[in-house]
C-alpha cells in the first residue's frame, strides 16, 4: 500500500492539513505551561514534566508514549554553602563577594528550585590568586597572551568573556594555559543591545543576570562515565578521576555588575588592540593582578558543588508508518531547562507539542504517515546532550539501520528577524522548496513567501538568489545522530540580524530572567514567529517521513565537497614550500570530490527515471539515499574524538558551537607551524587527506548502480 | 546635575486625597524608575511603589494598593503620587527618589513633602 | 515580604571611633544591600549598594560588607559629619523593605 491509500485524507491536501492545523495561539498556551516553574535536569519538576508530556501526547493520538530513563552525572550547587568570588585584601579578609543569586524578575518572586547560577562540572576549590583577563579566551587569545604579550597565565585565575565560542572551549584553553580557575562574565558589549532596557523592561541582561552553562569538553560522548554505552540498570561506571571531559580548575559565572568590581582594578599590561575592550568603564588591562594601590590584594574563589549521578526521563513517542514502519524519521528537542527556560527550551519544546498535537489530529482522522515518526523530550541536555545521547547509544543498531532524519527542536526563536537554518546539504532543497511554500511572518513581506524575506534577509555568501544555509556544529541535540551516527539532520529557528546585533546569542540566554514574559512581551507578542518555525520544522518532518522518493538531493553535497576541498587546500597552500618538501598532495581529493560529482549526478537522473510503482526499487533508491550520510562516517573516528566520525563535519576543536569541514584534516594543518616535529606533523595531514579522499570516494559508491 | 523637586507641604483632612508631585532634571527622564517612600514623624522608611516612565508600568506596596495612583507628564519630566482616603496615619514625609532600573538602589531623592492630615 | 532588622538602634560613639551596623534579613538577599545616611529634616542619601559597592562621592571610610543575610556597615573613623540615623535596605525583591534605622549619637 501506498501511504495515500492509508489515509482518508487527499493527497496534495495531506501537508496542507498538517500545516493548517498548527496554531499560534496553542504553542503560546503550551509556552507558558511548561515556563512557570524551573525544570532542571534530574529534578522531580522535570520528571513530572516528563509524565505530563507523556500523558499529552498519548492524548493527542500517537501510538504509543515511553519515558526512557537513564543514570547519568549531573552537578548541582551545594545549598547550604553557595558558591562565590570574592577579592581579599593581605589579611585574607573579604572586601568584596559577588553575588550569590540573581534578582528574582516580577512574578516569580516566591518560586523555589531556582538554581543559583553556576557552571556545572566545574570541581570544588577555593584557589587564590592574581586576576589575568583573557578576552573571549579563544584559542587566537591564547597564542596573543603567550606568545605576543609573554604573559604566563600559569597558576593565575583567568576572567574571560562569555560569546564568540562555547564556555567548555574556554574552560578547556584556560587549563591548558596553566590557570587555577576561571571566571566567566557577561560583557555588555555581547550582552547588551544599545537601545533596548534591560529585563524587565526589554530584552537586554541586568546588571545581576548572569548565564548558567556546562563547562565540559565531552566531544560528543554523553555521559562522562559511561562513554560509548547506554547510562542504564547494569552499566559499568568510570571513576570520576577516568570521567570523559570534566574540567580540572574550579570555574564560576558572574554578571557584568560583579565583573566591574574585578576589572576595573586590574593592571599589568594594556589591552593589546580594541578588540580586547567590551562595553564597562574598566581599562581592560590584561593584568597580571590588580595596579599599585591593590596591587596586595588577590582574588579567591569559592567552589562547593558537588557532581552526583541522577536519574533523568526522555519521553519517546511514536507515531507508526503505515508503508516502512522500520524507517525512523525523528523530530526532538530537550526538556530540561537552567531555570524557568522561557526560550531554551520551552519555545522549541511548545513548538514540537503543536507539531505533536496537528499529526495526532490527522491521525484520528484515519491518516498515517508513510514512515515511522519519532517524537521525543530529550532530558539533560544541558548537562552534556545527555538524554539524547544515552537514548543513542542505547538504540544505535535500530538507529544506524532504520534512522531517515533528524531535525532538532531546541530553542525556536533567538531574534525576531529572520530565519536560521543550519543542515546537511542532502536537505537544501527540501528547505528551499518548503520555506518557498509557506507564508513570511515578517513585517514588510506581507503576502510573501519565507523563502523571499530569508534570501533577502540572509542571502547565501555564494549563491545568489537564495539563502544562506549553515553547516551543523554541535551544542545541541542533533549531535550524537549526525556526528556519531551519519543520520541526516538539520535544525530551525528565528533569529537576529547578525549585521546590527554583534552581541553573542540572545542576552538573557540561561539566566533567570528567561520567562515567558520575555518572549510573550519583547520577542513575538503574537507568536507568528514560533507558528513559522512550527510550519518549517514540522514541514520538513512531514515530507520526510511522507514522500515517496526521499526528499535528498545528494547533488547538493556533491558541491559543498568542492567547496570544502577548495577551502582546506587554500589553507594547506599557505605553507607551499612544506608541502613541496613533505610531497603533499590533495590530488586524491579532488580526484573523489570529482567521482562524486560524477555518480551524484547519474544518479540524480535515475531517481528521476525510475519505476515508483515498483516498491523494491522504490526501497532500493531511498536506501541509497537514506545511507548516504552514513557513509561519511568512519568508525574509527577522528584523531583523539572517537565519537566525532563524521568525515566531512565536526563541531570545531576550538568552538563545540561552530561546524568545521574536513576537520580531519583542518585540525592536522592548525598552527602546524609552531609543531615540534614538522615531518610529523605533515605526515599526519597527509594520513588525513588519505581518510577524507577514501571516505568521499567510498560514498560516491554508495550511489553507483548496484549491480 | 541631577536634580529631584517635589511640590510644597500639604494639610488634608481624613477622607481626603493628596496628590504629590516630583519634577526630574538632569537626566533622561524615561531612562530611571521613580519611587515614593515614606517616612512617619520619628519613624522609619517605607517604600510606597515605583512608576516606571519608560512604560508606564507601576508597582505599588500591598499596603497601598487602591489607594495609591502614580502618572506622569512626561512634557514636564514630572511624576504624580496622588493617596486617597486618607487618615491620620498618612502623616507623613514623602519622597520620590530614583533608581536606576528594577534591581537597583535608590541614588537621588527628592527633598520632600510633608502631609499632614488632621481634622 | 522580607523583613529586615538593624542593631543597634542607637550607638554613643566619639569622632575617630570605629563604627559597626548590622543589619539582618528574614531570608538570603544575596548582596542586595544599599546602606543610606539621613540627617534630621533632610532626605535619605545612598552611600552603599549591593553590599558593598560605594557610592561615587561618598568617603572612603564608609565600607560595606556581608553576604545572604548578614551584613555591617563600617565607619572606619567616625567624623563629625557622621552623626546621623543609618538605613539598610534590601534591593533584591519587592517589596522594598528597610531596616528601623540606627542613629548615631555624639558621645
Known amino acids: 500500500k501506498s501511504s495515500n491509500e492509508a489515509t482518508n485524507i487527499t493527497p496534495k491536501h495531506n501537508m496542507k492539513a498538517f500545516l493548517d492545523e498548527l496554531k499560534a495561539e496553542n504553542i503560546k498556551k503550551f509556552l507558558y505551561n511548561f515556563t512557570q516553574i524551573p525544570h532542571l535536569a534530574g529534578t522531580e519538576q522535570n520528571f513530572q514534566l516528563a509524565k505530563q508530556i507523556q500523558s499529552q501526547w498519548k492524548e493527542f493520538g500517537l501510538d504509543s508514549v515511553e519515558l526512557a530513563h537513564y543514570d547519568v552525572l549531573l552537578s548541582y550547587p551545594n545549598k547550604t554553602h553557595p558558591n562565590y568570588i570574592s577579592i581579599i585584601n593581605e589579611d585574607g579578609n573579604e572586601i568584596f563577594n559577588t553575588s550569590l543569586f540573581e534578582p528574582p524578575p516580577p512574578g516569580y518572586e516566591n518560586v523555589s528550585d531556582i538554581v543559583p547560577p553556576f557552571s556545572a562540572f566545574s570541581p570544588q576549590g577555593m584557589p587564590e590568586g592574581d586576576l589575568v583577563y583573557v578576552n573571549y579566551a579563544r584559542t587566537e587569545d591564547f597564542f596573543k597572551l603567550e606568545r605576543d604579550m609573554k604573559i604566563n597565565c600559569s597558576g593565575k585565575i583567568v576572567i574571560a568573556r562569555y560569546g564568540k565560542v562555547f564556555r567548555g572551549n574556554k574552560v578547556k584553553n584556560a587549563q591548558l594555559a596553566g590557570a587555577k580557575g576561571v571566571i566567566l562574565y557577561s560583557d555588555p558589549a555581547d550582552y547588551f543591545a544599545p537601545g533596548v532596557k534591560s529585563y524587565p523592561d526589554g530584552w537586554n541582561l541586568p546588571g545581576g543576570g548572569v548565564q548558567r552553562g556546562n563547562i565540559l569538553n565531552l566531544n560528543g560522548a554523553g555521559d562522562p562515565l559511561t562513554p560509548g554505552y547506554p547510562a542504564n540498570e547494569y552499566a559499568y561506571r568510570r571513576g570520576i578521576a577516568e570521567a570523559v571531559g570534566l574540567p580540572s580548575i574550579p570555574v564560576h559565572p558572574i554578571g557584568y555588575y560583579d565583573a566591574q568590581k574585578l576589572l576595573e582594578k586590574m593592571g599589568g599590561s594594556a589591552p593589546p588592540d580594541s578588540s580586547w575592550r567590551g562595553s564597562l568603564k574598566v581599562p581592560y588591562n590584561v593584568g597580571p593582578g590588580f595596579t599599585g594601590n591593590f596591587s596586595t590584594q588577590k582574588v579567591k574563589m569559592h567552589i562547593h558543588s558537588t557532581n552526583e549521578v541522577t536519574r533523568i526521563y526522555n519521553v519517546i513517542g511514536t507515531l507508526r508508518g503505515a508503508v516502512e514502519p522500520d524507517r525512523y524519521v525523528i523530530l526532538g528537542g530537550h526538556r530540561d531547562s537552567w531555570v524557568f527556560g522561557g526560550i531554551d527550551p520551552q519555545s522549541g519544546a511548545a513548538v514540537v507539542h503543536e507539531i505533536v498535537r496537528s499529526f495526532g489530529t490527522l491521525k484520528k482522522e484515519g491518516w498515517r504517515p508513510r514512515r515511522t515518526i519519532l517524537f521525543a523530550s530529550w532530558d539533560a541536555e544541558e548537562f552534556g546532550l545527555l538524554g539524547s545521547t544515552e537514548w543513542a547509544e542505547e538504540n544505535s543498531r535500530l538507529l544506524q539501520e532504520r534512522g531517515v532524519a533528524y531535525i532538532n527542536a531546541d530553542s525556536s526563536i533567538e531574534g525576531n528577524y529572520t530565519l536560521r537554518v543550519d543542515c546537511t546539504p542532502l536537505m537544501y532543497s527540501l528547505v528551499h522548496n518548503l520555506t518557498k511554500e509557506l507564508k513570511s511572518p515578517d513585517e514588510g513581506f506581507e503576502g510573501k513567501s519565507l523563502y523571499e524575506s530569508w534570501t533577502k534577509k540572509s542571502p547565501s555568501p555564494e549563491f545568489s538568489g537564495m539563502p544562506r544555509i549553515s553547516k551543523l556544529g554541535s551544542g545541541n541535540d542533533f549531535e550524537v545522530f549526525f556526528q556519531r551516527l551519519g543520520i541526516a539532520s538539520g535544525r530551525a529557528r528565528y533569529t537576529k540580524n547578525w549585521e546590527t546585533n554583534k552581541f553573542s546569542g540572545y542576552p538573557l540566554y540561561h539566566s533567570v530572567y528567561e520567562t515567558y514574559e520575555l518572549v510573550e512581551k519583547f520577542y513575538d507578542p503574537m507568536f507568528k514567529y514560533h507558528l513559522t518555525v512550527a510550519q518549517v520544522r514540522g514541514g520538513m518532518v512531514f515530507e520526510l517521513a511522507n514522500s515517496i522518493v526521499l526528499p535528498f538531493d545528494c547533488r547538493d553535497y556533491a558541491v559543498v565537497l568542492r567547496k570544502y576541498a577548495d577551502k582546506i587546500y587554500s589553507i594547506s597552500m599557505k605553507h607551499p614550500q612544506e608541502m613541496k618538501t613533505y610531497s603533499v598532495s590533495f590530488d586524491s581529493l579532488f580526484s573523489a570530490v570529482k567521482n562524486f560529482t560524477e555518480i551524484a549526478s547519474k544518479f540524480s537522473e535515475r531517481l528521476q527515471d525510475f519505476d515508483k510503482s515498483n516498491p523494491i526499487v522504490l526501497r532500493m533508491m531511498n536506501d541509497q539515499l537514506m545511507f548516504l550520510e552514513r557513509a561519511f562516517i568512519d568508525p574509527l573516528g577522528l584523531p583523539d574524538r572517537p565519537f566525532y566520525r563524521h568525515v566531512i563535519y565536526a563541531p570545531s576543536s576550538h568552538n563545540k558551537y561552530a561546524g568545521e569541514s574536513f576537520p580531519g584534516i583542518y585540525d592536522a594543518l592548525f598552527d602546524i607551524e609552531s609543531k615540534v616535529d614538522p615531518s610529523k606533523a605533515w605526515g599526519e595531514v597527509k594520513r588525513q587527506i588519505y581518510v577524507a579522499a577514501f571516505t568521499v570516494q567510498a560514498a560516491a559508491e554508495t550511489l553507483s548502480e548496484v549491480a | 546635575q541631577v536634580q529631584l523637586v517635589q511640590s510644597g507641604a500639604e494639610v488634608k483632612k481624613p477622607g481626603a486625597s493628596v496628590k504629590v508631585s516630583c519634577k526630574a532634571s538632569?537626566?533622561?527622564?524615561?531612562?530611571?524608575?521613580m519611587h515614593w517612600v515614606r517616612q512617619a514623624p520619628g519613624q522609619g522608611l517605607e517604600w510606597m511603589g515605583y512608576?516606571?516612565?519608560?512604560?508606564?508600568?507601576?508597582r505599588y506596596a500591598q499596603k497601598f494598593q487602591g489607594r495609591v495612583t502614580m502618572t506622569r507628564d512626561t512634557s514636564t519630566s514630572t511624576v504624580y503620587m496622588e493617596l486617597s482616603s486618607l487618615r491620620s496615619e498618612d502623616t507623613a514625609v514623602y519622597y520620590c527618589?530614583?533608581?536606576?532600573?528594577?534591581?537597583?538602589?535608590?541614588?537621588?531623592w527628592g527633598q520632600g513633602t510633608t502631609v499632614t492630615v488632621s481634622s | 515580604d522580607i523583613q529586615m532588622t538593624q542593631s543597634p538602634s542607637s550607638l554613643s560613639a566619639s569622632v575617630g571611633d570605629r563604627v559597626t551596623i548590622t543589619c539582618r534579613a528574614s531570608k538570603s538577599i544575596s548582596k542586595y544591600l544599599a546602606w543610606y545616611q539621613q540627617k534630621p529634616g533632610k532626605a535619605p542619601k545612598l552611600l552603599i549598594h549591593s553590599g558593598s559597592s560605594l557610592e561615587s562621592g561618598v568617603p572612603s571610610r564608609f565600607s560595606g560588607s556581608g553576604s545572604g543575610t548578614e551584613f555591617t556597615l563600617t565607619i572606619s573613623s567616625l567624623q563629625p559629619d557622621d552623626f546621623a540615623t543609618y538605613y539598610c535596605?534590601?534591593?533584591?525583591?519587592?517589596?522594598?523593605?528597610f531596616g528601623q534605622g540606627t542613629k548615631v549619637e555624639i558621645k
Open positions: 512608576f516606571n516612565p519608560y512604560n508606564d508600568y507601576t
Open positions: 538632569g537626566y533622561t527622564f524615561t531612562d530611571y524608575y
Open positions: 535596605q534590601q534591593h533584591i525583591e519587592y517589596p522594598w523593605t
Open positions: 527618589a530614583r533608581s536606576d532600573g528594577y534591581y537597583d538602589a535608590m541614588d537621588y
